[in-house]
């Protein structure tokens, strides 16, 4: 016989990302003996929860918890049995629940209580279900991206830790109900609410972050639909030849469309709405989402929100990626420059429903929304955040890094399990997210 070296023991962590449109479960793993190294935590597996987001179960909280069961059962299989008790399990809810909490706090509490009850039935180390703030969502997405791309710290070939010179990447997340922009900045923020100080691996980071509620893809589409009903009676962003019955209650039930809600409307009434494939009118409709009229600071992005000039390279993920990837892959259009992105949006908006279906077969009706989505992404980046051609050249659209989904979930777990120490390697202390 001879000694055989055993593979290092693995630790696991589970995060349920309860988004506005759906919930995803991510299982992460890392070698137990290398907990404080960087870039060591990776995605082990993932699972998409069937049905809508947990906020869609406001009238049926037990349905929210029941929807999670399939993925939790998968987690029991994916995490070795002997590791169950030591595996932290978190649920973080984002803008869908933030909106529900604004309009119906009791329902929001009931949904969280229901999912908490279910999650405690499992043998994992359940550490809570809560609603993340927009600031947390932005910062944890930024942490995830930079952790995965090893921008915080690296182990050199001389056996020493060093901080890479390339600096950090900004992060842009486009969810269903909100969008976040987060990047490192040198000067203090004029609005303290949008500045976060981080201490990671002995380095200090000053980070600008802002979350725009109601500027997620799904809510933007609802707001455009409400505007189209109000001003046109047809939808300039939908393709010609596409028409559907719109239930007014669905359009106006969101707090995001409250401003467009008619005084007296029949929530059960259905209105037939048709597309007109009009890129110019669509652009005007999308422009109406942004206000540049007043800015109480030296500079703003939009809606009077302070934002320093965008600096450095950025990773744009979630619906940013899906929208741009659709233009690039399914439509075969170049999107390397802002000008090309605008031309691609116009191209999609010019397509009839017949043309669009023929180019992209086998798709659900949301195919009709890619024009509006593309127009919104282009306007948000160029007019909203102020990316010019040079700055846009530093934006990469990505879904994964190192085989791990880019989003807030990993950063959230890294923080809550103290997997990123505040101090340099060698010292063992937790992260300071002050």
């Amino acid at each position: 016989t001879r000694d055989v070296r055993e593979p290092p023991a693995l630790k696991y962590g589970i995060v349920l990302d309860a988004g506005s449109s759906h919930t995803s479960m991510f299982i992460y793993k890392w070698p137990a003996d290398k907990e404080n190294d960087t870039g060591i935590v990776g995605q082990h597996s993932s699972c998409d929860v069937p049905g809508g987001g947990i906020s869609s179960y406001a009238d049926n909280p037990s349905g929210a918890s029941q929807s999670l069961v399939g993925c939790l059962e998968q987690a029991l299989q994916d995490v070795p049995k002997e590791r169950h008790a030591g595996t932290p399990l978190y649920l973080g809810a984002t803008a869908g629940m933030r909106l529900l909490n604004l309009t119906n706090p009791e329902a929001s509490t009931s949904v969280l209580m229901a999912v908490t009850h279910t999650l405690t039935q499992y043998p994992f180390d359940f550490r809570g279900a809560r609603i993340l703030s927009g600031q947390e969502e932005g910062v944890f997405g930024w942490v995830t991206a930079n952790y995965l791309l090893e921008n915080f710290i690296k182990y050199g070939w001389v056996g020493r830790w060093f901080r890479p010179r390339k600096g950090t990447l900004g992060a842009m997340d486009l969810g269903g109900a909100s969008t976040q922009i987060t990047f490192e900045t040198t000067s203090p923020a004029e609005d303290r609410a949008s500045e976060v100080q981080l201490h990671l691996y002995g380095q200090h980071y000053r980070v600008y972050t802002h979350s725009f509620l109601c500027y997620g893809r799904d809510q933007v589409l609802q707001r455009l639909l409400a505007s189209a009903l109000q001003t046109h009676g047809f939808h300039p962003c939908w393709p010609r030849g596409f028409s559907t019955q719109v239930l007014l209650g669905d359009v106006y039930q969101s707090p995001c469309t409250m401003a467009q809600r008619p005084q007296n409307f029949n929530s059960s009434a259905r209105v037939s709405l048709s597309g007109s494939s009009d890129p110019h009118l669509c652009r005007d409709l999308v422009s109406g989402l942004f206000s540049f009229s007043s800015c109480p600071f030296s500079r703003c992005s939009f809606n009077g929100v302070f934002q320093p000039p965008v600096a450095g390279n950025f990773v744009a993920f979630s619906a940013f990626f899906y929208t741009v990837d659709f233009l690039r892959t399914s439509m075969g259009l170049p999107v390397a420059t802002l000008q090309q992105l605008e031309a691609a949006a116009v191209n999609v908006c010019n397509q009839t429903w017949a043309q669009l279906q023929a180019r992209v077969p086998g798709q659900r009706a949301r195919l009709a929304d890619y024009c509006a989505g593309a127009m919104f992404v282009q306007q948000l980046l160029s007019r909203g955040y102020g990316f010019d051609e040079r700055a846009f050249g530093g934006v990469i659209f990505q879904k994964k890094a190192a085989d791990t989904a880019v989003g807030w979930a990993l950063g959230y777990m890294l923080n809550l399990t103290n997997l990123i120490p505040a101090d340099p390697p060698g010292l063992r202390k937790g992260t300071d997210f002050s």
Partner: antibody
Framework: QVQLVQSGAEVKKPGSSVKVSCKAS????????VSWVRQAPGQGLEWMGR????????QYAQKFQGRVTITADESTSTAYMELSSLRSEDTAVYYC?????????????WDQGTLVTVSS | SYELTQPLSVSVALGQTARITCSGD??????VYWYQQKPGQAPVLVIY???NRPSGIPERFSGSNSGNTATLTISRAQAGDEADYYC???????????FGGGTKLTVLG
């Protein structure tokens, strides 16, 4: 009733090319698309690429990119699939399938296929 | 890249219900299509858009799709239903049609 009629079986040498035709009889390509799908002996179905003749739009599976060319002649309602640099693994039945808007451009009409044998 | 996974084979007693599954990441967000292929023949579309039957396909054939699994259900299975069944879906990320590996249905008795 639209039918698709493909060209006959082919035996080819490794390294050569093959061009298979597919004619829509009793109909045209207006508003339709055509996909090419192959099936190696005893294996499953493998999508190769598609053409939307009335849009001049083609798409290819990454696996065949650079090796396959799909074209169409609208005047004769005929689609063509040319596969180059043939190897023995390309031995398969090659099907053309019509994609119909009524079925969200899934494959509603298939031909019986063309057997292509690649052998030295 | 996107993959669809099917069981290699499924057996069903004559007159009973057969269920063939097709799993893929978040497949419920995509439309699924099912094809029947008998030996030596071309495939035939039996279900489109998850659960719709083309004309000429018996009511015994039905489909469902949610979460990570789509299912083709054949009720009151007949000997003539013996065939290979393939699920298919369009992968938006790679702009391509994807087929499952196929399931051989055997009707016993």
């Amino acid at each position: 009733q639209v039918q698709l009629v493909q060209s006959g079986a082919e035996v080819k040498k490794p390294g050569s090319s093959v061009k298979v035709s597919c004619k829509a009889s009793g109909g045209t390509f207006d508003s339709y698309a055509v996909s090419w799908v192959r099936q190696a002996p005893g294996q499953g179905l493998e999508w190769m690429g598609r053409i939307v003749p009335w849009l001049g739009h083609t798409q290819y599976a990454q696996k065949f990119q650079g090796r396959v060319t799909i074209t169409a002649d609208e005047s004769t309602s005929t689609a063509y699939m040319e596969l180059s640099s043939l190897r023995s693994e390309d031995t398969a039945v090659y099907y053309c399938a019509r994609e119909s808007p009524g079925y969200r451009y899934s494959f509603d009409v298939w031909d019986q296929g063309t057997l292509v044998t690649v052998s030295s | 890249s996107y993959e669809l996974t099917q069981p290699l084979s499924v057996s069903v007693a004559l007159g009973q219900t057969a269920r063939i599954t097709c799993s893929g990441d978040a497949i419920g967000e995509k439309y699924v299509y099912w094809y029947q292929q008998k030996p030596g023949q071309a495939p035939v579309l039996v279900i489109y858009d998850d659960n719709n039957r083309p004309s000429g396909i018996p009511e015994r054939f039905s489909g469902s799709n949610s979460g990570n699994t789509a299912t083709l259900t054949i009720s009151r299975a007949q000997a003539g239903d013996e065939a290979d069944y393939y699920c298919a879906s369009y992968d938006l990320q790679q702009a391509r049609w994807v087929f499952g590996g196929g399931t051989k249905l055997t009707v016993l008795g």
